[in-house]
Amino acid sequence: EEELQVIQPDKSVSVAAGESAILHCTVTSLIPVGPIQWFRGAGPARELIYNQKEGHFPRVTTVSESTKRENMDFSISISNITPADAGTYYCVKFRKGSPDTEFKSGAGTELSVRAKPSAPVVSGPAARATPQHTVSFTCESHGFSPRDITLKWFKNGNELSDFQTNVDPVGESVSYSIHSTAKVVLTREDVHSQVICEVAHVTLQGDPLRGTANLSETIRVPPTLEVTQQPVRAENQVNVTCQVRKFYPQRLQLTWLENGNVSRTETASTVTENKDGTYNWMSWLLVNVSAHRDDVKLTCQVEHDGQPAVSKSHDLKVSAHPKEQGSNTAAENTGSNERNIY
């Protein structure tokens, strides 16, 4: 006569987190009398998942009616699966007794849980950096399973190659995390640029998750200065302009100095934006030449985004009859601020 066999037909079952897992088990005989129990793991530390005889197992339901007279199907469904449920499940037949004794075990079914990675979070450097500098961006995503995952970096759609990625932990775990650091060389045109971290995983069905960082939060483009003398507006008056070009971010303070003495300080307000996201600004200074007997050194001093000031000077000759000494060749529209100095 054939002895009872416990059949677990599935070697492995893979389930998405949040779904229900069905673990199949049938027995070939009703002999001996005694309950079926399900365990996660083997050995003395195994965890009881379901006992046909007694106990309360709120997440477990029997697939077929376990009280049915000739029932030999002891498959179970475990609801609301989480990565913590991963492991090998054994269907075990016990023989009635005091206590019940283990009679025969199935071969086991390995349950793997497919858990989606969290939305990648990209973070850049704490301080702004200027073009030509290399900055690091980090990307993190957590809680995924299985461990296999693909991470790519892009800058404005172009794939980056200079990055390092780690998946933790190295050994077996219920879920995993990924951490990647990419190096990006900044250019003056990067105000509108984006760095993208893209994560692909089996749970995402070909639709990867993306995290982005705007380089506008990272880059500082220092201004270029040009001081020019405009044509005479009136007798004894000269108009000097300081063109502040291609700067980012907008935070900027300009100071005019006459022969080293502060003449006026102003904050950039009505700026114009270039296509590349940088800003231009222009400040005017109206100088009354008749008030000066010697030549005047005019200095435009700019403090940008809390950085050390940069300046550009222009020598105004008062001995010569005022004439045009320079012209504005900038193609951009410019804002204006006008002050008269007497």
């Epitope: 006569e1 054939e2 002895e3 009872l4 070939t28 005989s29 009703l30 002999i31 001996p32 009398v33 005694g34 309950p35 046909q52 005889k53 007694e54 376990s66 009280t67 007279r69 029932n71 030999m72 023989r95 009635k96 007794g97 005091s98 206590p99």
Partner: antibody
Amino acid sequence: RQLVESGGGLVQPGGSLRLSCAASGFSLSSHGISWVRQAPGKGLEYIGTIGTGVITYYASWAKGRFTGSKTSSTAYLQMTSLRAEDTAVYYCARGSAWNDPFDYWGQGTLVTVSS
Amino acid sequence: DIVMTQSPSSLSASVGDRVTITCQASQSVYGNNDLAWYQQKPGQAPKLLIYLASTLATGVPSRFSGSGSGTDFTLTISSLQPEDFATYYCLGGGDDEADNTFGQGTKVEIK
């Protein structure tokens, strides 16, 4: 699906008897067969269950004198050292109890122990 | 060994009556539910009515129901029918697989 007993009859005290229980409509391979007896005018009394070779068990009072066996189609109950108080109708039933109750019963066979 | 005590040993009732028979075990039955009820008519083999304390066997009318757990169990016939006049036995199982004992029976007679 039915069970049919045979082998009952008159036997002298101290004698032996083998009862048969033939199954039709199902195989006994995956089922236990239990034996129950009922003395005239009395209640039901559980004797034991025959599962497989390893899994055979008897009520404490029946151990030693009663032995069961079965094939895929027939179960047997061997009774020895019979006494007058063993006089009863003997039933075989499919099942081992608990979640495998006695759902199909034979018609019973009368065993009379008398000199 | 487990001892099953049925009460009453006999009762008289009329068709349409609600009938209740109790069975008490000397110790908790196996799994708190190893209790079956059988019906036996004169000259016939017993018939399974209820198992696992409350599960109705196939083909048994729904007027029969079982309840209870541990040591105290009840068989209820909600509306007695003429064919229900018979003797009813409970069968309780202890923790040992051979420890199966019938109650002494309850005879339901026509009033």
